[in-house]
């Protein structure tokens, strides 16, 4: 699709080509199942270009198709200790907010191995909040390059 | 300047218990995983538990799981072992390690260590 | 778990000489993710290498790590009176993080 040379002085942002790409802040504390996200050109290669974080929760501002993607790495693993836990490690991205959108967009397990990534193309509307969710005990890496999060909007 | 200073070490008889502590200075504290690592005489190094930062999740050796407790206190910026059914094998100098910023356990910083010795 | 076997178990030399160190693991390490620590008689270990090859903060280059998979090699290229010690290489790809027993390099 080629742009007018009027779309071509725009910024990005007013054509609705949102795009974040955030890494690993911290994890929650107990009972809080949620990985916490930061973004930034002084943290490295993460950027926000349109969404918003929300206490480290990946909030969306523009309606439209986004593809969602998402690797993560445990620093503290071992491939029996991801197969033998009572709860098994699993990694769960979703809609968490508003509370009448909430849904489950991408669901992995770690079975026999320390790196999952997966990736989807979803709608997604102004004000959903994504988060991401690492059930069981073990510990993702916050290397920039085993652990990333972000969203690319697609079309309307 | 990063610095760890461990304490409650001592002596105690088999089955008993004791609780050390950490004290944590020079860094942002609950932004990093930390661990304890354990030396007994003339052994070698022996990891025994880990906490992520925010204290949400923890990490036990087999020889001591179920027996010893990793907690820490962001706001004291301490970190806690505690340990209940000691063993003569526990006997050890107790090393506070902080994780690297990646969370991998490898060991950037480690307190001087406090002793504890177990036996009748 | 991974063991980790580390050879010699002591290592005579004089100043200036090079010393080797290896430490070879049981099974492949995950990401060469090894580190090698410097203890001296009645400290704590500390951190040398980390990644089988990246220099910790304030680490002089006579230290470098190498190898990867199962066998890792310390080299310190001349020998500074203050390098003789105990050094220990650990692992930290898998869980349980597990640590050699030690090569001690003591003067000749």
């Known amino acids: 699709q080629r742009l007018s040379r009027a779309q071509q002085q725009l910024p990005l942002e007013s054509l609705g080509w949102d795009i974040a790409e955030l890494q690993l802040n911290h994890t929650g504390p107990q009972q809080d199942p949620r990985l916490y996200w930061q973004g930034g050109p002084a943290l490295g290669r993460s950027f926000l270009r349109g969404p918003e974080l929300d206490k480290g929760q990946l909030r969306i501002r523009r309606d439209g198709i986004y593809m969602v993607h998402i690797q993560v790495t445990l620093a503290i693993c071992s491939s029996t200790s991801t197969s033998r836990h009572h709860h098994p490690t699993t990694l769960a991205v979703g809609i968490c907010s508003p509370a009448s959108r909430s849904i489950s967009l991408l669901r992995l397990s770690f079975h026999q191995g320390c790196t999952i990534a997966s990736q989807r193309l979803t709608p997604l509307a102004r004000g959903d909040t994504l988060c991401t969710n690492l059930t069981g005990t073990l510990l993702p890496s916050r290397n920039t390059d085993e652990t990333f999060f972000g969203v690319q909007w697609v079309r309307p | 300047e990063v610095q760890l200073l461990e304490s409650g070490g001592g002596m105690v008889q088999p089955g008993g218990s004791l609780r050390l502590s950490c004290a944590a200075s020079?860094?942002?504290?609950?932004?990093?995983?930390m661990s304890w690592v354990r030396q007994a005489p003339g052994k070698c190094l022996e990891w025994v538990s880990a906490?992520?930062?925010?204290?949400?999740?923890?990490f036990y050796a087999e020889s001591v799981e179920g027996r010893f407790t990793i907690s820490r206190d962001n706001s004291k910026n301490t970190l806690y072992l505690q340990m209940n059914s000691l063993r003569a094998e526990d006997t050890a100098v107790y090393y506070c390690t902080k994780h690297d910023y990646s969370n991998y356990p490898y060991f950037d910083y480690w307190g001087q260590g406090t002793l504890v010795t177990v036996s009748s | 778990e991974i063991v980790l076997t580390q050879s010699p178990g002591t290592l005579s030399l004089s100043p200036g000489e090079r010393a080797t160190l290896s430490c070879r693991a049981s099974q492949g390490v995950r990401s060469d993710y090894l580190a090698w620590y410097q203890q001296k008689p009645g400290q704590a270990p500390r951190l040398l290498i980390y990644?089988?090859?990246s220099r910790a903060t304030g680490i002089p280059d006579r230290f470098s790590g190498s190898g990867s998979g199962t066998d890792f090699t310390l080299t310190i290229s001349r020998l500074e009176p203050e390098d003789f010690a105990v050094y220990h290489c650990q692992q930290y790809g898998s869980t349980p993080p597990t640590f050699g027993c030690g090569t001690k390099v003591e003067i000749k």
């Open positions: 990644g089988a090859s």
């Open positions: 020079g860094f942002t504290f609950s932004s990093y995983a």
């Open positions: 906490i992520s930062g925010s204290g949400g999740r923890t």
